[in-house]
Interface confidence: medium
């Protein structure tokens, strides 16, 4: 792929090469959609995608989820996946702008954090904003989960999977009313288990951008287009939490 | 059994007022983003208006956006519908709808509004 | 919130197949967004057919089947019987949180 700089990127932003983002990163599509075989965010190995065999569940609520959408859709009618990762409490209602001042960073002070950790993003994400998650992915490790959440919808769900059919694969997709929508898969997998880690995701008007370790990773188009309503990053996973913060770039 | 029965449709003049209810069973109604569609008479199905299982998000169709407002009672196991400034062309039967992101799977049997003079 | 294109109406003979499609944009339909089918007999209200482009609730006939590609969202009838002479309806959300019908095409069984 075409590599650009940040400063292409954002030319005319008068920060030509802003703290913290990779100089330079793959001018890549978002990733193909699902296939056959492909597992829901949270499932467990072995779960297959709507279309992929006849008779197949498709993705559903997850059952236990905590906040306003505990529940399975109806019986016979939106069969669930067997687990997942429940919902984030719901946060305050999001204000109406995303005015964020390009200072910072705002967020988790540096020390180890409690995982599942939420970091609350009050005026939603805008573009240019940077979010930077430090941490280290625990031995033995099985997921990581971001969970860029609006309300009990997931905006952006990146999801590292450490072991799906003994392979290593991340799973990005989208929550909305109660339901999975169609995943985007990458295959190439920057994390090691008992490793550090950084992961950097920038908001972009149309996409968001991940970085992992200075390198780009990928990038998934906003399906969730009310950027101002995505008021919560929540943060689980087999990872040791550093910190959590955000910036404008 | 799953049921919606919609209720408070009639005849109304021109830049009046209507209070639509639907009255939800068989389900845990706060878990469920609810919807309004109408139909008008002899014509296709048009989204109204959507509310999230908590209320927090609220959305609209541009034909509707400033003179409808819906809302929910999770208590009461209703979904509400206050329509104002209503024109002739908001004529149409009005079904309430149980949502998900892959289909909306139970639909009330519908109310009819009539705005005429 | 343009509504999504169908053809205004399709006929088919008993034991025939049939096909209605369903074009939208890449913010409804192409955007990684579901398309769902409804079923309406005149006089009652709208029945979920296929659910997340391709999926049949329980109780719909296999008869009935959806898939997608690109913008176009299609939906296959096989076996055609006189019981499902309808209105059929196409609906995809969109990424304004909002949700788009087709303008319906109506089923004529010969």
């Known amino acids: 792929a075409d590599n650009f700089s940040l400063h292409d990127a954002l030319s005319g932003s008068g920060n030509p090469n802003p703290q913290g983002w990779p100089g330079a990163w793959g001018n890549q599509p978002a990733g193909a959609g699902g296939y056959p075989g492909a597992s829901y965010p949270g499932a467990y190995p072995g779960q297959a995608p709507p279309g992929a065999y006849p008779g197949q569940a498709p993705p559903g609520a997850y059952p236990g989820a905590p906040g306003a959408y505990p529940g399975a859709p109806a019986p016979g009618v939106y069969p669930g996946p067997p687990s997942g990762p429940g919902a984030y409490p719901s946060s305050g209602q999001p204000s109406a702008t995303g005015a964020y001042p390009a200072t910072g960073p705002y967020g988790a002070p540096a020390g180890p954090l409690i995982v599942p950790y939420n970091l609350p993003l009050p005026g939603g994400v805008v573009p240019r904003m940077l979010i930077t998650i430090l941490g280290t992915v625990k031995p033995n490790a099985n997921r990581i989960a971001l969970d860029f959440q609006r309300g009990n919808d997931v905006a952006f769900h990146f999801n590292p999977r450490f072991n799906e059919n003994n392979r290593r694969v991340i799973v990005c997709n989208t929550k909305l009313d109660n339901n999975w929508g169609r995943e985007e898969r990458q295959s190439v997998f920057p994390f090691e288990s008992g490793k550090p880690f950084k992961i950097q995701v920038l908001v972009e008007p149309d996409h968001f951008k991940v970085a992992v370790n200075d390198a780009h990773l990928l990038q998934y188009n906003h399906r969730v287009k009310k950027l101002n309503e995505i008021s919560k990053l929540g943060i689980s996973g087999d990872i040791d939490l550093t910190s959590a913060s955000y910036t404008m770039i | 059994e799953v049921q919606l029965v919609e209720s408070g449709g009639g005849l109304v003049k021109p830049g009046g007022s209507l209070r639509l209810s639907c009255a939800a069973s068989?389900?845990?109604?706060?878990?469920?983003?609810m919807n309004w569609v109408r139909q008008a008479p002899g014509k296709g199905l048009e989204w109204v208006s959507s509310i999230y299982g908590s209320s927090r998000y609220i959305y609209y169709a541009d034909s509707v956006k400033g003179r409808f407002t819906i809302s929910r009672d999770n208590a009461k196991n209703s979904l509400y519908l206050q329509m104002n400034s209503l024109r002739a062309e908001d004529t149409a039967v009005y079904y309430c709808?149980?949502?998900?992101?892959?289909?909306?799977?139970?639909w009330g049997r519908g109310t009819l509004v009539t705005v005429s003079s | 919130q343009s509504a999504l294109t169908q053809p205004a109406s399709v006929s088919g003979s008993p034991g025939q197949s049939i096909t209605i499609s369903c074009t939208g944009t890449?913010?409804?339909?192409?955007?990684?967004?579901?398309v769902a089918w409804y079923q309406q007999h005149p006089g009652k209200a709208p029945k979920l057919m296929i659910y997340?482009?391709?999926y049949r609730p329980s109780g719909v006939s296999n008869r009935f089947s959806g898939s997608k590609s690109g913008n176009t969202a299609s939906l296959t009838i096989s076996g055609l019987q006189a019981e499902d002479e309808a209105d059929y309806y196409c609906s995809s959300y969109t990424g304004y949180s909002t949700r788009v019908f087709g303008g319906g095409t109506k089923l004529e069984i010969k």
């Open positions: 997340y482009d391709s």
């Open positions: 068989g389900f845990t109604f706060s878990n469920y983003n």
């Open positions: 709808v149980r949502s998900s992101y892959g289909g909306m799977d139970v």
């Open positions: 890449s913010s409804d339909v192409g955007g990684s967004y579901n």
